[in-house]
Interface confidence: low
């Protein structure tokens, strides 16, 4: 595929990445799939600066990110190492709370109203943020 050098329409460029901010809600898996169909992934937060950028754009609204522990350990969807990477959990989080009555614990991470992170039931219909890196190979065929 061709190399993407600028962001798609309605995406926001920042630090050589492109971001798309939803204004509707989906379950985490549906949001994850949406981003993948856009040749992107749910946002992966690698620095405090990126955290603040995303926070600035989403405002005080619960919003999914590309972090989950549905298979055991916490993992970023793009393979970024969780243990050594940036984290911004709320106090006492993640807690894998079972008391919500929806079955199971809490396996998906989202930005809360103050930007810090919480784990929640993956089926909740939250907004989401997609991210794709500039300069990576696009799956779209080159324009002739």
């Amino acid at each position: 595929g061709s190399e993407r050098t600028c962001c798609p329409v309605n995406w926001v460029e920042h630090e050589r990445s492109c971001y798309w901010f939803s204004r509707s809600g989906k379950a985490w898996a549906d949001a994850d799939n949406y981003c993948r169909l856009e040749d992107a992934h749910l946002v992966v937060v690698t620095s405090w600066e990126e955290q603040k950028f995303v926070q600035h754009h989403i405002g005080p609204v619960n919003t999914w990110m590309g972090l989950h522990d549905q298979n055991g350990p916490w993992k970023w969807v793009d393979g970024t190492d969780y243990e050594t990477g940036f984290k911004n959990w709320r106090p006492e989080q993640p807690d894998d709370w079972y008391g919500h009555g929806l079955g199971g614990g809490e396996d998906c991470a989202h930005f809360t109203d103050d930007g810090r992170w919480n784990d929640d039931v993956c089926q909740r219909p939250y907004r989401w943020v997609c991210e794709t890196e500039l300069d990576k190979a696009s799956q779209e065929p080159p324009l002739l």
């Epitope: 620095s47 600066e49 603040k52 930007g115």
Partner: antibody, heavy 125, light 108 residues
């Protein structure tokens, strides 16, 4: 007026502990992130640690990780640095500084805009 | 860790002249850079944040510019009180927050 005053420095033997304090006045302490920054004699500035406005998050430099702990008591308008297992290389002037970028309200207005005058820590046998 | 490199280490300037200080980051820090001034026996003082935004009370003769990896602090028409050590500091990728080694601006 806005002021930060450090205390608790002194001469201490290697391996011993010390707790620094930073008393804040003239502003809403609980709305600001706070840092400790140190400066060895004749050297440049070295960031030591940061704590969020509400104490919920804190980070330490690798050089002090596992030995130093930053904390705060918003009811007392005071920032702390607990220093354990002190080494000769920890000898420095220690400054506290506030930073709105890690505060309650302003996400983009970064900058250590108010500093204390510092407290001297000397680690020597 | 992002390494900040300042040059020159010492800059000799006459009062009234312009001083140009450089700061280079080992990788991009966007515009997330601050400049501090420190006089002997005193705490550092914030001059610039966001690469070019003057902090409260800082005179207009202090000007910051740059983005990415290359930054400049320009002091126009140096006053006697401007002779000091100047540090740059990045807050883009951390921990750790990192400072440059400093540039001493001395009287020529």
């Amino acid at each position: 007026q806005v002021q930060l005053v450090e205390s608790g420095g002194g001469v201490v033997q290697p391996g011993r502990s010390l707790r620094l304090s930073c008393a804040a006045s003239g502003f809403t302490f609980s709305s600001y992130g706070m840092h400790w920054v140190r400066q060895a004699p004749g050297k440049g500035l070295e960031w030591v640690a940061v704590i969020w406005y509400d104490g919920s998050n804190k980070y330490h430099a690798d050089s002090v990780k596992g030995r130093f702990t930053i904390s705060r008591d918003n009811s007392k308008n005071t920032l702390y640095l607990q220093m354990n297992s002190l080494r000769a290389e920890d000898t420095a002037m220690y400054y506290c500084a506030r930073d709105e970028g890690f505060g309650e309200f302003d996400y983009y207005n970064y900058g250590m805009d108010v500093w204390g005058q510092g407290t001297t820590v000397t680690v020597s046998s | 860790e992002i390494v900040m490199t300042q040059s020159p280490a010492t800059l000799s300037v006459s009062p009234g002249e312009r001083a140009t200080l450089s700061c280079r980051a080992s990788q991009s820090v966007s515009r997330n850079l601050a400049w501090f001034q420190q006089k002997p026996g005193q705490a550092p003082r914030l001059l610039i944040y966001g690469a070019s935004i003057r902090a409260t009370g800082i005179p207009a003769r202090f000007s910051g510019s740059g983005s990415g990896t290359e930054f400049t602090l320009t002091i126009y028409s140096l006053q006697s009180e401007d002779f000091a050590v100047y540090y740059c500091q990045q807050y883009n990728n951390w921990p750790p927050l990192t400072f440059g080694g400093g540039t001493k601006v001395e009287i020529k």
